[in-house]
């Protein structure tokens, strides 16, 4: 297993609709034809997998059916969007990139993106 550098933004603020997007960029040492991207969430020293996708020559990442993630790729950049976030989902979201093929296998883990989610205030009742 060889190490690889992965860069991602330090902080992202989710939209009022609970959507957060960020770019995960990896320094590929060669021309990988099969790449696996995993988003991990670290909160209270616990790490859980949020979503994962394996992609090849296309620019659309395909996630499992119940995934809250969507994404596209362009070169060595992956544009990730996480949906359905609530305040309790605030945490550090880590991008993990694996170059699956061809050998050798490379693994890179980013420093994480702190995603802040603020639940929208309920609209006050209006007389109008």
């Amino acid at each position: 297993c060889k190490a690889m550098h992965v860069a991602q933004p330090a902080v992202v603020l989710a939209s009022s609709r609970g959507i957060a997007s960020f770019v995960c960029e990896y320094a590929s040492p060669g021309k990988a034809t099969e790449v696996r991207v995993t988003v991990l969430r670290q909160a209270d020293s616990q790490v859980t997998e949020v979503c994962a996708a394996t992609y090849m020559m296309g620019n659309e990442l395909t996630f499992l059916d119940d995934s809250i993630c969507t994404g596209t790729s362009s070169g060595n950049q992956v544009n990730l969007t996480i949906q359905g976030l609530r305040a309790m989902d605030t945490g550090l979201y880590i991008c993990k990139v694996e170059l699956m093929y061809p050998p050798p296998y490379y693994l890179g883990i980013g420093n994480g993106t702190q995603i802040y989610v603020i639940d929208p205030e309920p609209c006050p009742d209006s007389d109008f």
Epitope: T33, E34, M57, G58, N59, L64, S67, T70, G71, Y101
Partner: antibody, heavy 115, light 106 residues
């Protein structure tokens, strides 16, 4: 040029198993998914699953779990689908298609399950 | 799984006319892709990533849309466009196709 060539049409009895092949040429085999698609007579398209030829990574439509198994032999740039415990409902045309974009398809193999 | 609903299921058009086929997804998808299938042949990639024409596809075909609602338009229908058209999503597994729209050119 890119070409996908499938095995010939097949007639089998219920309960039997079958292997269909998809021979790829004209491109780097390990750089693209191979997808398998089922089409029953007069019906639409159903995605069965896909395999990454380099690593062997597979994704399946749950509807075909236990029915279909995807494999590849990279040395011969050939992908295979193994269909088991065949029933009349498995009678269909089976296609293989290349990559994320399904940009090249083979001509299709007609599988007929009949007693 | 994401269900793609195409409408209409069958339609008829005259040469030179304009037709629009719609594809509605049960939940938002990143892109929609379109295929054309003529009787007895394999499907052919027509449009990918919602609006990009595949190689060799005539400019009279176009695609548009976002979120859950997409469409395929043929601006000037020709006799050779008689076929069944399928939309497809690749945002989540399993990959799914719409039920198809059969276009008859009279």
């Amino acid at each position: 040029q890119v070409h996908l060539q499938q095995s010939g049409d097949v007639l089998v009895k219920p309960g039997a198993s079958v292997n269909l092949s998809c021979k790829a040429s004209g491109y780097t085999f390990t750089s693209y998914w191979i997808n398998w698609i089922k089409q029953r007579p007069g019906q639409g398209l159903e995605w069965i699953g896909r395999i990454a030829p380099g690593s062997g990574t597979t994704y399946y439509n749950e509807m075909f779990t236990g029915k279909a198994t995807l494999t590849v032999v990279t040395s011969s740039t050939t992908a295979y689908i193994h269909l088991s415990s065949l029933s009349f409902e498995d009678s269909a045309v089976y296609f293989c298609a290349r990559g994320d974009y399904f940009d090249y398809w083979d001509q299709g193999t007609t599988l007929t399950v009949s007693s | 799984q994401i269900v793609l609903t195409q409408s209409p299921a069958i339609m008829s058009a005259s040469p030179g006319g304009k037709v629009t086929i719609t594809c509605s997804a049960s939940k938002s998808v990143s892109y929609i892709h379109w295929f054309q299938q003529k009787p007895g042949t394999s499907p052919k990639l027509l449009i990918y990533d919602t609006s990009t024409l595949a190689s060799g596809v005539p400019a009279r075909f176009s695609g548009s849309g976002s979120g859950p609602s997409y469409s395929l338009t043929i601006s000037r229908v020709e006799a050779e466009d008689a076929a069944t058209y399928y939309c497809q999503q690749r945002t989540t597994y399993p990959l799914t196709f719409g039920g198809g729209t059969k276009l008859e050119v009279r």
